[in-house]
């Protein structure tokens, strides 16, 4: 069954945590649907963003942070492991020094920590996708 | 009650026709939600686009056409009559020489015909909005 989009969930992250997302683009890649995942510092959508991950399917991925309301320097990748019309599984793992993003089991993107992952309080998944799974797993201490 | 998004409807347009859309952005303008309206030449979403209208709320509007699979020259406007968090009413009127786009009753954008409006067979409304009304009115002959 489908989860509502935008999908918002409270989350606490630290090294060893993994956010897993399963979904499907709502349009063909020719029409450039988007997927966005934002790790927020508060439960409010206007709060700062520790890690912003935006896919323009078929074109590019951009990653960034939003601090005190201002976007910082964007990181862009042309790597495009997503398949047109196909379901994807995305997992974002918190490593000691960076986020590692896996797409369908394949390491695809990394983003150095600019802000501590412990500052994350909420994850939002949105834009042009249908969503079937959202999970935050915590490393057993 | 809400219409599904993406929303797709068969349509035939000619001078005098008006497409009316009522909806609301799904996110605050800080997060840059999008609205897109595409007038397609076929019932398929990968078909050419006679008139492409895309709002990045709070930032800009771009208009274009997609012909034989290729995007043409984009027209950009910084005019932003949409209000953060507020419902909007958008009407696109087919004039003899152009499309006229009204936002909340105010003439906001125009786009010269590149392809005959009679070539339109389908209208799609999508991206980061909730949709409460979609209507195509035809001029009585």
């Amino acid at each position: 069954s489908l989860l509502p989009v935008p999908y918002t969930e409270a989350a606490s992250l630290s090294t060893g945590s993994t956010v897993t997302i399963k979904g499907r683009p709502l349009a063909c890649f020719l029409n450039e649907p988007y997927l966005q995942v934002d790790f927020h510092t508060e439960m409010k959508e206007e709060s700062d963003i520790v890690f912003h991950f935006q896919v323009c399917f078929g074109r590019r991925v951009v990653m960034n942070s939003r601090e005190y309301g201002a976007w910082k320097q964007q990181v862009e990748s042309k790597n495009m492991p997503f398949q047109d019309g196909q379901e994807f599984e995305l997992s974002i793992s918190v490593l000691p020094d960076k986020y590692q993003v896996m797409v369908n089991g394949q390491s695809s993107y990394t983003f150095d920590h600019r802000i501590k992952p412990e500052a994350v309080k909420m994850v939002q998944v949105w834009r042009d996708i249908s969503l079937t799974k959202f999970n935050v797993s915590y490393l057993k201490r | 009650s809400l219409l599904p998004v993406p929303y797709t409807e068969a349509a035939s347009l000619s001078t005098g026709s008006t497409v009316t859309i009522k909806g609301r952005p799904l996110a605050c303008f800080l997060n840059e939600p999008y609205l897109q309206v595409d007038f397609h030449t076929e019932m398929k979403e990968e078909s050419d686009i006679v008139f492409h209208f895309q709002v990045c709320f709070g930032r800009r509007v771009v208009m274009n056409s997609r012909e034989y699979g290729a995007w043409k020259q984009q027209v950009e406007s910084k005019n932003m009559p949409f209000q953060d968090g507020q419902e909007f009413e958008l009407s696109i009127s087919v004039l003899p020489d152009k499309y006229q786009v009204m936002v909340n009753g105010q003439s906001s954008y125009t786009f010269d015909h590149r392809i005959k409006p009679e070539a339109v067979k389908m209208v799609q409304v999508w991206r980061d909005i909730s949709l409460t009304k979609f209507n195509v009115s035809y001029l009585k002959r």
Epitope: K72, Q73, R114 | -
Partner: antibody
């Protein structure tokens, strides 16, 4: 061996200008964000400015904003600091420093290599 | 105005003992701390980054931690060569560095 060598310091009158250079060697200069940090005589460190690896993004301390301009020439492996409208309080040793991680001047990872510094004296 | 990080002006430690230097006033719940060692007439040297990471070549006796608005540099078993000034650094934002006023480690 990684080296950062500053030059261009000297005596200048208040209101005057100076251009500092930092010649980099021993690493892929074009891949790293860089910074200028200064230290007034007998005082602590003060961050002045930084620039991303490509040169398209810059940041400045409030105390120098509008007067100083950071830039880089990746073909020449050189970092610059153009200092205008100099004030007596700008008098300091100016250090050029390399950020530990690539492209972005990420304070989280600090600055792992520093030059020996060049002295700027502002006096009439 | 720049964010202000407050450090004690001096900390005294006996040879082989543990020194702790604090840095207050930073948003260490959000931003990481780095620490630098500076000896007279020399350029600063990075000894800790990302709160607790040591660059290669830095002895294990140097460690770091942070909690709330305070970051701490700990030197376990201080050696004579550790006598120096120590500066904390964090961010007003991730790309906007700010330094503490510095702490002179003495007594060695």
């Amino acid at each position: 061996e990684l080296q950062l060598v500053e030059s261009g310091g000297g005596l200048v009158q208040p209101g005057g200008s100076l251009r500092l250079s930092c010649a980099a060697s021993g690493f892929t200069f074009s891949s790293y964000a860089m910074s200028w940090v200064r230290q007034a005589p007998g005082k602590g460190l003060e961050w002045v400015s930084n620039i991303n690896s490509g040169g398209g993004s810059t940041g400045y301390a409030d105390s120098v904003k509008g007067r100083f301009t950071i830039s880089r020439d990746n073909a020449k492996n050189t970092l610059y600091l153009q200092m205008n409208s100099l004030k007596p309080e700008d008098m300091a040793v100016y250090y050029c420093a390399k950020y530990l991680r690539t492209y972005y001047p990420n304070a989280a990872f600090g600055m792992d290599y520093w030059g020996k510094g060049t002295l700027v004296t502002v006096s009439s | 105005s720049q964010a202000v990080l407050t450090q004690p002006s001096a900390v005294s430690v006996s040879l082989g003992q543990t020194a702790r230097i604090t840095c207050q006033g930073g948003n260490f719940g959000r931003y990481y701390a780095s620490w630098y060692q500076q000896k007279p007439g020399q350029a600063p040297v990075l000894v800790i980054y990302r709160d607790s990471e040591r660059p290669s070549g830095i002895p294990e006796r140097f460690s770091g931690s942070s909690s709330g608005d305070t970051a701490t540099l700990t030197i376990s078993g201080a050696q004579a060569e550790d006598e120096a000034d120590y500066y904390c650094q964090s961010g007003r934002s991730s790309d906007n560095a700010v330094f503490g006023g510095g702490t002179h480690l003495t007594g060695l």
